[in-house]
């Protein structure tokens, strides 16, 4: 799994007027890492995980860079011609990755009102855009502005690929990112669904990294995908992740079903609690 740094900048306009505030979120290896608030930008660690790892480091450099990025994106939004009345947003997402073989990937994506309209591979400098006429118009608009105002937006757009990778390497070097494995806690619960049926839910929480296999098995055989419901793998705010899988089974058949979990090379099976016991908690052996 590669190391990654992801910047998510959002600026807003109201009735054609670009708002002064902006929001910047930075994710490090998929985890919320830094955030600049809408009105005043002060880079600050997100959650207990970031605080524990980052300690009392000051974030002046990041605050300066993110503030500059926000200003530049506001300038870009001001040059989008089809500003209609009401609320509109321009979002830029920039991602860079360092893979285990030291190869790198960098990309930049623009969204208007939540819809992707322009992407750039920052290594090859190749631009791509969706086929819709709206996206094409927006893309031409923004690309023309970036070409015309290259000097004004230099802080934001110049050598973004190098800047992003430089920051990521700096964080890696300073020990901010720890290659760690945190095993999940697995809970299996049951709830009445309908006459003669129960829903069994298997929840995995507190795990890192995010890759996990979670599925229901009957007599040791995986149930088909369409008989199971999966939740998204989501950050839980502690630098770890959570997810779930559920299926509906006949009452009395509980002992034939197990939740299978695989994470970072470790695996375990978890039975359905019988009778009145509602929650069964277990770690791997």
């Amino acid at each position: 799994e590669p190391h990654s740094l992801r910047y998510n900048l959002t600026v807003l306009s109201w009735d054609g007027s670009v708002q002064s505030g902006f929001l910047t979120e930075v994710h490090l290896d998929g985890q919320p890492f830094l955030r600049c608030d809408r009105q005043k930008c002060r880079a600050k660690p997100q959650g207990q995980w970031a605080e524990d790892v980052l300690g009392n480091k000051t974030w002046d450099r990041e605050t300066r860079d993110l503030t500059g990025n926000g200003k530049d994106l506001r300038m870009t939004l001001a040059h989008i011609k089809d500003q209609k009345e009401g609320l509109h947003s321009l979002q830029e997402i920039r991602v860079c990755e360092i893979h285990e073989d030291n190869s790198t990937r960098s990309s930049q994506h623009f969204y208007y009102d939540g819809e992707l309209f322009l992407s750039q591979n920052l290594e090859t400098k190749e631009w791509t855009m969706p086929q819709s006429s709206r996206a094409q118009t927006l893309a031409m608009n923004v690309r023309n502005f970036l070409k015309e105002d290259a000097m004004k937006t230099k802080t934001h757009y110049h050598a973004m690929h190098a800047d992003c990778l430089q920051e990521l390497r700096r964080y890696l070097k300073s020990g901010v990112v720890l290659r760690r494995t945190v095993p999940p806690m697995v809970n299996v619960t049951r709830s009445e669904a309908s006459e003669g049926n129960i829903t069994v839910t298997c929840r995995a929480s507190g795990f890192y990294p995010w890759n996990i296999t979670l599925s229901w098995r009957q007599d040791g055989v995986s149930l088909s995908h369409d008989t199971q419901q999966w939740g998204d793998v989501l950050p839980d705010g502690n630098g770890t992740y959570q997810t779930w899988v559920a299926t509906r089974i006949c009452q009395g058949e509980e002992q034939r079903f197990t939740c299978y979990m695989e994470h970072s090379g470790n695996h375990s099976t978890h039975p359905v609690p019988s009778g009145k016991v509602l929650v069964l908690q277990s770690h791997w052996q």
Epitope: Q218, D219, G220, V221, S222, L223, S224, D226, T227, C250, Q255, R256, Y260, E262, G265, H267
Partner: antibody, heavy 120, light 107 residues
Framework: EVQLVESGGGLVQPGGSLRLSCAAS????????MNWVRQAPGKGLEWVSY????????YYADSVKGRFTISRDNAKNSLYLQMNSLRDEDTALYYC?????????????WGQGTLVTVSS | DIQMTQSPPSLSASVGDRVTITCRAS??????LNWYQQKPGKAPKVLIY???SLQSGVPSRFSGSGSGTDFTLTISSLQPEDFATYYC?????????FGPGTKVDIK
């Protein structure tokens, strides 16, 4: 005593069809998932298809997908395999096998097999 | 699909010998591994399930071990009725696959 008896095998030309049956007795058929497994003459075992007891999970080997259909009739305690577009390489002894309750996808009882020969 | 390999393909042994057959999966299959015995003209019979659990009615001289990708079936003291072909089978994936078999015959 658990018994599985296959039938329906025979000689068929390439491109032809056959329907195999497996009659189950000695256990509550509707509570068990079932499989078809085949064995070409002098060769090893090859899993063909799986159907769970509630009939909402069915799997096929890539080699038969789109040509074979597994089904069951719990009222008749029977398992079926409809085989279409048969090929020379489908020639084999076909076994039905029961999945053990609370096992690890374990086939705990097998029939004696029915021979399918595909040849022109 | 997950490929299963077995070694050796065949072996000759004497009554009383300790026999070990190995099975390797092309990717991790946790403990979803079963062992079967098949005698000529007969249907297979399950010996071990879940990599190491002995099926009811199977003599205790049969044992299984392993997890992940490497598994072993051991017959602690070979008996005349144990001369047969042995197959491993994975059920981790929903495309169940068998190993090619190991034939155990009399030396």
């Amino acid at each position: 005593e658990v018994q599985l008896v296959e039938s329906g095998g025979g000689l068929v030309q390439p491109g032809g069809s056959l329907r195999l049956s497996c009659a189950a007795s000695g256990f509550t058929f509707s509570s068990y998932s079932m499989n078809w497994v085949r064995q070409a003459p002098g060769k090893g075992l090859e899993w063909v298809s799986y159907i769970n007891y509630s009939e909402n999970t069915i799997y096929y080997a890539d080699s038969v997908k789109g040509r074979f259909t597994i089904s069951r009739d719990n009222a008749k305690n029977s398992l079926y395999l409809q085989m279409n577009s048969l090929r020379d390489e489908d020639t084999a002894l076909y076994y039905c096998a029961r999945v053990m309750v609370r096992g690890t996808g374990t086939f705990d009882y097998w029939g004696q097999g029915t021979l399918v020969t595909v040849s022109s | 699909d997950i490929q299963m390999t077995q070694s050796p393909p065949s072996l000759s042994a004497s009554v009383g010998d300790r026999v070990t057959i190995t099975c390797r999966a092309s990717q991790s299959i946790s403990s979803y591994l079963n062992w079967y015995q098949q005698k000529p003209g007969k249907a297979p019979k399950v010996l071990i399930y879940g990599a190491f659990s002995l099926q009811s009615g199977v003599p205790s001289r049969f044992s299984g071990s392993g997890s992940g990708t490497d598994f072993t079936l051991t017959i602690s003291s070979l008996q005349p009725e144990d001369f047969a072909t042995y197959y491993c089978q994975q059920s981790y994936s929903t495309r169940f696959t068998f190993g090619p078999g190991t034939k155990v015959d009399i030396k």
